[in-house]
């Protein structure tokens, strides 16, 4: 019986509200045996693949995508997808990255720790079939 791949989850450390110039790390998680994790922007025209996978637990693998110095252009929704041979998974839910000015006024939101988007029960759009094979475009280990 063909394996049903669970949807990945995505989270951000230290959170989803990041001061301009600070760093953020997106963490993608999936089942064991994942070969490639991909972090996508909303349009899917911009993405980054990594094969620096680690085993987060006996049943879970993860990859980390770090942006060293966040700019306003980094703001927006991100999601994860993974390749577990021979299939691509569905996409995770979106996680919205907010970039705030460092002036730190009274109305500035604090960094939200441990923000994440996990699997949900909504049906798949099957768009994972459109993705390139895992052997393509696996160079950069940082997003920008």
């Amino acid at each position: 019986q063909e394996e049903d791949l669970p949807r990945p989850s995505i989270s951000a450390e230290p959170g989803t509200v990041i001061p301009l110039g600070s760093h953020v790390t997106f963490v993608c998680r999936g089942p064991v045996g994942v070969q490639t994790f991909r972090l996508e922007r909303e349009s899917r025209s911009t993405y980054n693949d990594t094969e620096d996978v680690s085993q987060a637990s006996p049943s879970e693998s993860e990859a980390r995508f770090r942006i060293d110095s966040v700019s306003e252009g980094n703001a927006g929704p991100y999601r994860c997808i993974y390749y577990k041979p021979p299939k691509w998974s569905e996409q995770s839910d979106y996680l919205e990255l907010l970039v705030k000015e460092t002036s730190g006024g009274p109305d500035s939101p604090d960094t939200e720790p441990g923000s994440s988007a996990g699997p949900t029960q909504r049906p798949s759009d099957n768009s994972h079939n459109e993705h390139a094979p895992a052997s393509q475009g696996l160079k950069a280990e940082h997003l920008y």
Epitope: E2, G33, Q35, E51, S54, K139
Partner: antibody, heavy 121, light 108 residues
Amino acid sequence: EQSLEESGGDLVKPEGSLTLTCTASGFSFNSNYWICWVRQTPGKGLEWIGCIYSGSSGDTYYASWAKGRFTISKTSSTTVTLQMTSLTAADTATYFCARGADYVYWSYGLWGPGTLVTISS
Amino acid sequence: ELVLTQTPASVSAAVGGTLTIKCQASETIGTNLAWYQQKPGQPPKLLIYLASYLASGVSSRFKGSRSGTEFTLTISDLDCDDAATYYCQSTHFGNGHTFGGGTEVVVK
């Protein structure tokens, strides 16, 4: 206990063909594994030939040098075969089948003992 | 095509000592690398997967590490039973499951 065993090794004349069989015991190829073939020439290193996904998709994946002359097929829930054609003396080797599993990230945690193939006139 | 260059081709070390085997990948394979031990007349035995994770039942004297495209297998507190040939292997589906050339280990 889970195990793999290769069979079909033989003495074959150059330009001949041969089919090797990998048989599983204690588990079935209906689960999500990659069943792979590796060969080792006498006194030399290991050479990867290719793999087949044991799930329903049956995806295959070959070393570039093996494409066209070697074919891996799943023939039943417990057997996978390696068909070899246009054999030459350079194909003389011990042939192993091995199982790649997700929990060891497609490393080969289970191997058969190997079967010897000799190509000679 | 991916090439894995293993060094040294052979090494001799004393019982109780430590030795290091290196495996250099010609392309990026992330953490998708395994190490095996093979003794004469036997199939290979999995030691390390995903570059640094110890396979079930394997002694903690074996340690795998990675720096970019260079991978290292370290065997500490060498035992006579460690005498064998060691191979690295890419487990990357895009680049092929290539093996390194092997390192023969002699324990004195």
